[in-house]
């Protein structure tokens, strides 16, 4: 079915809000543990599917709304399930700037959508 | 505590439109999204879409995308949900709602606002 | 979309017993699974949020399990009070799904 997104975000926004939660912080989410993941393996699914878990945390909800609305493109955003490093967990913050530095990467060189 | 209070019942003609609105209070109107949901009588809860408030960004359900609005007056913390081409189809209670706790699961609702269409 | 599949449609029980109820979706949901209870007349109160977290005030007789597709709500010790409709919503994926509805009510 075409997609619910309208008009869905961009990796633009993205970056920016993802620039917006983590600037000038230490921690997020008073410091909560998230699985590790391959954001490789179609990054925006890769990032909600690990993000998902994390409740009562404001600072980060419209993080997990962008990434959810581009999860949910089909077939752009990639819903190949990721790999979880289950053996591997890391702060919010962590998660979110490797998210911030990927993201970056892919936008600068317009491998994208 | 968080309060959504929704405009009264509307009895509209097909083909017309509605506009329903939301007041909220007891939180930062711009720190989360609301969310619309309606159910038609005696049926289950069908999901519309979501504003956020902060940036006027919306989320729709590709069934409603051509017909309806979603809206939000920060100066009043009023959210409003506007459908048009009205039909008998549209009989419904329409609820807002906010979520707090946990990203996209509604936990506190308006008390909803029964739509009529009728000629 | 995801499908959410909900069943017993209805379910008539015994007060002091347990009730289940299952959800079964389209597709993966991770964690993504809530689920709502809803009296005649009111609007719908969230109970449980992430498959297994109750809200506060939400009692422990409550309990949500499962993972991937498959999901279960359980009331233990069933009630009066604990008639109406159960709705399980996925929030993994936009739209956002509900399951039909499980209709609990008291022999």
């Known amino acids: 079915s075409p997609s619910p997104v309208t008009p869905s975000p961009t990796l633009k926004e993205l970056i920016e809000e993802l620039v917006n939660i983590t600037q000038n912080q230490a921690s997020l989410c008073n410091g909560s543990m998230v699985w590790s993941v391959n954001l490789t393996a179609g990054m925006y699914c890769a990032a909600l599917e690990s993000l998902i878990n994390v409740s009562d945390c404001s600072a980060i909800q419209r993080t997990q709304r962008m990434l959810k609305a581009l999860c949910s493109q089909k077939p752009a955003a990639g819903q190949i399930s990721s790999e979880r490093s289950r053996d591997t967990k890391i702060e919010v913050i962590q998660l979110v700037k490797n998210l911030l530095t990927y993201v970056r990467g892919v936008y600068r060189h317009g491998n994208f959508r | 505590e968080v309060q959504l209070v929704q405009s009264g019942a509307e009895v509209v003609k097909p083909g017309a439109s509605v506009k329903v609105s939301c007041k909220t209070s007891?939180?930062?109107?711009?720190?989360?999204?609301i969310y619309w949901v309606r159910q038609a009588p005696g049926a289950g809860l069908e999901w519309i879409g979501y504003?956020?408030?902060?940036?006027?960004?919306?989320t729709y359900n590709q069934n409603f995308k051509d017909r309806v609005t979603l809206t939000a007056d920060k100066s009043t913390s009023t959210a409003y949900m506007e459908l048009s081409s009205l039909r008998a189809g549209d009989i419904a209670v329409y609820y807002c709602a906010t979520a707090v706790v946990a990203t996209d699961v509604m936990e506190n609702w308006g008390q909803g606002t029964l739509v009529t269409v009728s000629s | 979309d995801i499908v959410m599949t909900q069943t017993p449609l209805s379910l008539s029980v015994s007060p002091g017993e347990t009730a289940s109820i299952s959800c079964k979706a389209s597709?993966?949901?991770?964690?993504?699974l809530a689920w709502f209870r809803q009296k005649p007349g009111q609007s719908p109160q969230a109970l449980i949020y992430?498959?297994?977290n109750r809200y506060p005030g939400v009692p422990d007789r409550f309990s949500g399990s499962g993972s991937g597709t498959d999901f279960t709500l359980r009331i233990s010790r069933v009630e009066a009070e604990d008639t109406g409709v159960y709705y399980c919503l996925q929030h993994w994926q936009y739209p956002l799904t509900f399951g039909a509805g499980t209709k609990v009510e008291l022999k």
């Open positions: 504003i956020d408030p902060y940036n006027g960004g919306t």
């Open positions: 992430l498959v297994s």
């Open positions: 007891g939180y930062s109107f711009t720190d989360y999204p």
């Open positions: 597709q993966n949901l991770r964690n993504a």
